[in-house]
Amino acid sequence: KFSKQSWGLENEALIVRCPRQGKPSYTVDWYYSQTNKSIPTQERNRVFASGQLLKFLPAAVADSGIYTCIVRSPTFNRTGYANVTIYKKQSDCNVPDYLMYSTVSGSEKNSKIYCPTIDLYNWTAPLEWFKNCQALQGSRYRAHKSFLVIDNVMTEDAGDYTCKFIHNENGANYSVTATRSFTVKDEQGFSLFPVIGAPAQNEIKEVEIGKNANLTCSACFGKGTQFLAAVLWQLNGTKITDFGEPRIQQEEGQNQSFSNGLACLDMVLRIADVKEEDLLLQYDCLALNLHGLRRHTVRLSRKNPIDHHS
């Protein structure tokens, strides 16, 4: 429960806070869990403890591991664990998922991107900001204290933002970078009665007996984030799960957002080893949201084998 994941890049500073809180007057001892070896407090060491903080100046890949902190007071001891992973620097621009901090969302009215973990460090303004590895330039971007402000946010502003700053420890400077994703919420979003794009109403789908067949139920519900929208298949008027035919399963497709901003959902019905009796069933694509519910019906017909002449 009192364990925290922390990560950093080799040759950068990393500062980790003990997951157990205590008053500033309480002493905190740090140990490397694997060896139970005490972490020194002398600042001349590359890795040292400073009260509630564990400092890697700079970090090395070999520092990865679990560190134990014990907060000691006159009446109790509290134990916490810091799971530290130090990664090699990537040669390319991509920031892997495991180096990403939590995603933040912004909109036209509110577009602050806070630099993660910066409050642990002794840094001085200004921060440097990068988007998808490119330094941000232009009047739309303003580095303000520990956050970036983007004016007139557009959907194109979504992406991975990296803040870079210098940590100063006793006159020595260490670089720190942190990356998080930024998504743009469309405040002009709306929802409407579901519109089923596929299948067509009363469509006849040709299938081959013994082969596999896929039917896609695709519907759009409006623009922007949609609340309680769903698409699903029904078989002879019941849920697929209630119908109880293991050869017929539905599988969620892609959540789509088209260039026109429409929010759409897909559900794929997979029929394995199509049998004659499948042709007798009625397949209904159901789309529903808070505005209403709409169905389109599909029936299967046997595909006549075509003679192939050379």
Epitope: Q201, N202, L228, N236, G237, T238, Q282, D284, L288, N289, L290, G292, L293, R294, R295, T297
Partner: antibody, heavy 118, light 107 residues
Framework: QVQLVQSGAEVKKPGASVKVSCKAS????????MFWVRQAPGQGLEWVGL????????IFAQKFQGRVTMTRDTSTSTVYMELSSLRSEDTAVYYC???????????WGQGTLVTVSS | DIQMTQSPSSLSASVGDRVTITCRAS??????LAWYQQKPGKAPKLLIY???SLQSGVPSRFSGSGSGTDFTLTISSLQPEDFATYYC?????????FGQGTKVEIK
């Protein structure tokens, strides 16, 4: 066995609100939609809307949009329908009904008479 | 909204008669149609679902047919307990609309 038990009759003044409950038993409450249907005296059946007890999602007939609220309490397997800004033409018996195959209604509550009168 | 039109609105028949009630949808509803029977002061009772499937416990003299826009409820041999009002309902698109009802009376 499946049972839907509704709350008792209500007399309300125009402009007031009424909240009717429907307690379900004998089946997995979250597995089936619950419909609300009303019937004015001497008239036919009119579909008010539905609630998905699993998610709380609701769909209403356009006529009732903005005036009707449907909620559910999964801990007591009860759904509620609240109708606000009551008018005399809202006088009716209100039924809850469980959804079955083809979204037909296989089990119905006993009905709750709501009378709106000044 | 999908309109459901029932005919006739009322009919008089005798015990043992074959009775047919029709229901027409304003657009195709595939087989998403149910038939209900209602007696005065009582909740409706499901007879037929999916246009032609007989609900469990309902006598076999009741049958349903149709698909798309035209549907029929047939009572093959009318019994004294069958005098009631019958409603069709589509559940293809919301709102799930009912027909106006057909009252079956004793001749």
């Amino acid at each position: 066995q499946v049972q839907l038990v509704q709350s008792g009759a209500e007399v309300k003044k125009p402009g007031a609100s009424v909240k009717v409950s429907c307690k379900a038993s004998g089946y997995t409450f979250t597995d089936s939609f619950m419909f609300w249907v009303r019937q004015a005296p001497g008239q036919g059946l009119e579909w008010v809307g539905l609630i998905n007890p699993g998610t709380g999602a609701t769909i209403f007939a356009q006529k009732f949009q903005g005036r009707v609220t449907m909620t559910r309490d999964t801990s007591t397997s009860t759904v509620y329908m609240e109708l606000s800004s009551l008018r005399s033409e809202d006088t009716a018996v209100y039924y809850c009904a469980r959804s079955s195959d083809y979204d037909s209604s296989d089990y119905w509550g006993q009905g709750t008479l709501v009378t709106v009168s000044s | 909204d999908i309109q459901m039109t029932q005919s006739p609105s009322s009919l008089s028949a005798s015990v043992g008669d074959r009775v047919t009630i029709t229901c027409r949808a304003s657009q195709s509803i595939s087989t998403w149609l149910a038939w209900y029977q209602q007696k005065p002061g009582k909740a409706p009772k499901l007879l037929i679902y999916g246009a032609s499937s007989l609900q469990s416990g309902v006598p076999s003299r009741f049958s349903g047919s149709g698909s798309g826009t035209d549907f029929t409820l047939t009572i093959s041999s009318l019994q004294p307990e069958d005098f009631a009002t019958y409603y069709c309902q589509q559940s293809y698109n919301s709102p799930y609309t009912f027909g106006q009802g057909t009252k079956v009376e004793i001749k």
